[in-house]
């Protein structure tokens, strides 16, 4: 059998296979050693017994989308049946005091590979043996502690495969400089050691995307905005726009990035090299926000001018892709990490990203201020309590609700929260009365709210001791 017979039915065209060569990866036309690595079809009954105590699930994730030329990283994590975990030696053990369907296990091991390898290796002195090989026959790399790596992962995409020895979690990075744009499929098959052979335990696939557009996200924040995720904001208060570029491999780290904003309110264009910008809308309504991000990124060089007379075909200048993984000190393949371009060739290409949002601007409460605090007369029966009136003004729209949060002087430990509806006139002047139990210093957070906004003000107040001898205290401000 060949690798493509085993690993998947996705068959890229001859063009794709030729133009998407991943360095360190091999053609899936290679032969697969079915004696060492048996192949089971989906639904084969043997899958049921491929793992003690249940099925292993493999979870494949990637940091897709990837800007063409950047590295994309794939991570596979194995999820074992309940109560099982991998220990420091790479053996699979039962968790202490964990009860599964079979109850508590007397044997601490699910798989004790350390013992197996000591018993059954039959190696020559080099630590190499005929069964410590990948499905294509290549020997396992002998990193320090390689014997504790008991899972074999075979990654397959674009008509090529990449083999990796690992523990219950592995990562593989691929450079996308030459990958065809658009969605691609990555498939991973996982085997475990089984004496002198291997047993399949999981298969998983995931779509990843390579794009020539910079992946751009914008977060928006505005003080007093009640719900930051609904793209509704308040008139006359600055909105902070923060651009997040999805660039997990730091491909654009050395690029100058320009941000060009149009806020849709006929205030022109704003061009900046800063990823944050503030803008205040002075009109309510719906506006179309547009952002264009431009970065000069490493890219393919234009073909050299044709020579006067072509003598014989020259090899393609196209950059080939390298893979390297994070469990090993160096690249996975034999080649070092640099792009295989002609020496000193260093070309750049402008890449663009776009973001568009429709944002709604509404009236809201812009500001709230406590302009006066008055100690209220209290009748005799409550000598320990103080009533205080807070006179509050606001700007912007008229609030429908007032909340007070009374807490300790550090404003961290809440003692009491009271919310109540309010009916306020156009002047936005209201009195909020609150009770304080006992003397001392209190932090008072007072918020006024309506459907779309929530404005806050804070103050520290000192409540004096009550004198039980005096039945009433005169109000003072």
């Amino acid at each position: 059998k060949r690798f493509h017979d085993v690993l998947g039915n996705e068959r890229p065209s001859a063009y794709m296979r030729e133009h998407n060569q991943l360095n360190g990866w091999s053609s899936d036309e290679n032969d697969w050693n079915e004696k060492l690595y048996p192949v089971w079809k989906r639904g084969d009954m043997r899958w049921k017994n491929s793992w003690k105590g249940g099925r292993v699930q493999a979870v494949l994730t990637s940091d897709s989308p990837a800007l063409v030329g950047s590295n994309i990283t794939f991570a596979v994590n194995l999820i074992f049946p309940r109560c099982q975990k991998e220990d420091a030696n790479g053996n699979i053990v039962y968790e202490k005091n964990c009860r599964n369907e079979a109850g508590l296990s007397a044997d601490p091991y699910v798989y004790n590979w350390t013992a197996w390898s000591e018993d059954s290796d039959g190696e020559n002195g080099t630590g190499q043996s005929h069964h410590n090989v990948f499905p294509d026959g290549k020997p396992f790399p002998h990193h320090p502690g390689w014997r504790r790596w008991n899972f074999i992962y075979v990654f397959h995409t674009l008509g090529q495969y990449f083999q990796k020895l690992g523990r219950c979690s592995v990562r593989v990075s691929v450079n996308t400089a030459n990958v065809t744009l658009g969605p691609q499929l990555m498939e991973v098959t996982v085997y475990r050691r089984h004496g002198r052979a291997y047993v399949p335990i999981a298969q998983v696939k995931d779509v990843y995307v390579v794009t020539d557009q910079i992946p751009v996200f914008v977060t928006m924040f505005q003080k007093n905005d009640r719900n930051s995720s609904d793209e509704t904001f308040l008139k006359d208060l600055p909105i902070m726009f923060d651009v997040l570029i999805h660039d997990p491999s730091h491909f654009l780290n050395y690029s100058t990035i320009n941000y060009k904003w149009s806020f849709g309110d006929n205030t022109g264009l704003f061009v900046s090299t800063n990823h944050t910008v503030n803008h205040t809308y002075v009109l309510n309504g719906t506006f179309s926000l547009n952002l264009t991000v431009k970065a000069a990124a490493p890219g393919p060089c234009p073909p050299p001018p044709p020579p006067p007379r072509p003598s014989k075909p020259t090899p393609s200048l196209a950059t080939t892709l390298k893979s390297y993984d994070s469990n090993t000190p160096g690249p996975a393949g034999d080649n070092p990490l640099e792009l295989s371009r002609i020496p000193d060739e260093n070309c750049q290409i402008n890449r663009y990203g776009h973001f568009q949002a429709t944002i709604t601007i509404v009236e809201g409460i812009l500001e709230v201020n406590i302009i006066q605090m008055t100690d209220v007369l209290m009748p005799v029966p409550w000598p320990e309590s103080s009533l205080i009136d807070f006179v509050v003004t606001c700007q912007g729209s008229i609030p429908t609700e007032v909340c007070t949060i009374i807490s300790d002087p550090t404003c961290e430990i809440t003692q009491n929260t009271v919310c109540s509806p309010v009916d306020v006139d156009e002047m936005c002047l209201l009195t909020v009365r609150r009770t304080f139990n006992g003397s001392g210093t209190y932090c008072v957070n007072l918020t006024l709210g309506d459907d779309t906004s929530l404005a806050l003000t804070s103050t520290l107040i000192s409540v004096p001791d009550r004198d039980p001898a005096s039945p009433l205290r005169m109000a003072n401000s």
């Epitope: 309110d265 006929n266 205030t267 022109g268 264009l269 061009v271 009109l283 309510n284 719906t286």
Partner: antibody, heavy 119, light 107 residues
């Protein structure tokens, strides 16, 4: 094509009000801001305020708050500016204007309406 | 509020001359500035947008330059129809503000 057609000249008494109209055609009225500009005889241009016809949202320069009121009627694609408590200082040509299809200030202008305040 | 200082307030020139009008903003307005030409009894007409871009149908003898806070309008090879009033407008933020205007007269 985009057109802004303003109402005709007005001769009004001090202390009264006047309402100037600006009828838009050739585009989606709700999608573009309408701005108003004042020009006194022999003087420069002065921005008054702006209305978002889609929402009715307005913004005025401080000196025209209370003097000018901007409204819009989507059904007739017409923007209005009402000027109140008129004095001789309000005698001027008033223009409505609108931006291009991208954020670029005023590209299209009405022909102007002359308001004369005189006893 | 952004103030726009336009100079000169008036100037005279001859046919075929090259003239420059400047506008200075009290803060950075990027390139969010337009130039308008106005003839008596007419509304302003759109000449230049984004400080340097020629509006549709405007002859190439008109050009704009500048960014940030300093801007200029240049007319090379003056023709008779170019004698008019010229205004700059900042539309970077509200309130919009115009320059005081430049009256270009024939010598």
């Amino acid at each position: 094509q985009v057109q802004l057609q303003q109402s005709g000249a007005e001769l009004v008494r001090p202390g009264t009000s006047v309402k100037v109209s600006c009828k838009a055609s050739g585009y989606a009225f709700s999608n573009h801001l309408i701005e108003w500009v004042k020009q006194r005889p022999g003087q420069g241009l002065e921005w008054i305020g702006v209305i978002n016809p889609g929402s009715g949202g307005t913004n005025y320069i401080e000196k025209f708050k209370g003097k000018a009121t901007l409204t819009a009627d989507k059904s007739s694609s017409t923007a209005y500016m009402q000027l109140s408590s008129l004095t001789s200082d309000d005698s001027a040509v008033y223009f409505c204007a609108r931006g291009a299809n991208w954020d670029v200030g005023f590209a299209y202008w009405g022909q102007g309406t002359l308001v004369t305040v005189s006893a | 509020e952004i103030q726009m200082t336009q100079s000169p307030s008036s100037m005279s020139a001859s046919l075929g001359d090259r003239i420059t009008i400047t506008c200075q903003a009290t803060q950075d307005i990027v390139k969010n500035l337009n130039w308008y030409q106005q003839k008596p009894g007419k509304p302003p007409s759109f000449l230049i947008y984004y400080a340097t871009e020629l509006a549709e149908g405007v002859p190439s003898r008109f050009s704009g330059s500048g960014s940030g806070s300093d801007f200029s309008l240049t007319i090379s090879n003056l023709e008779s129809e170019d004698f008019a009033d010229y205004y700059c407008l900042q539309f970077h933020e509200f309130p919009r503000t115009f320059g005081g205007g430049t009256k270009l007269e024939i010598k």
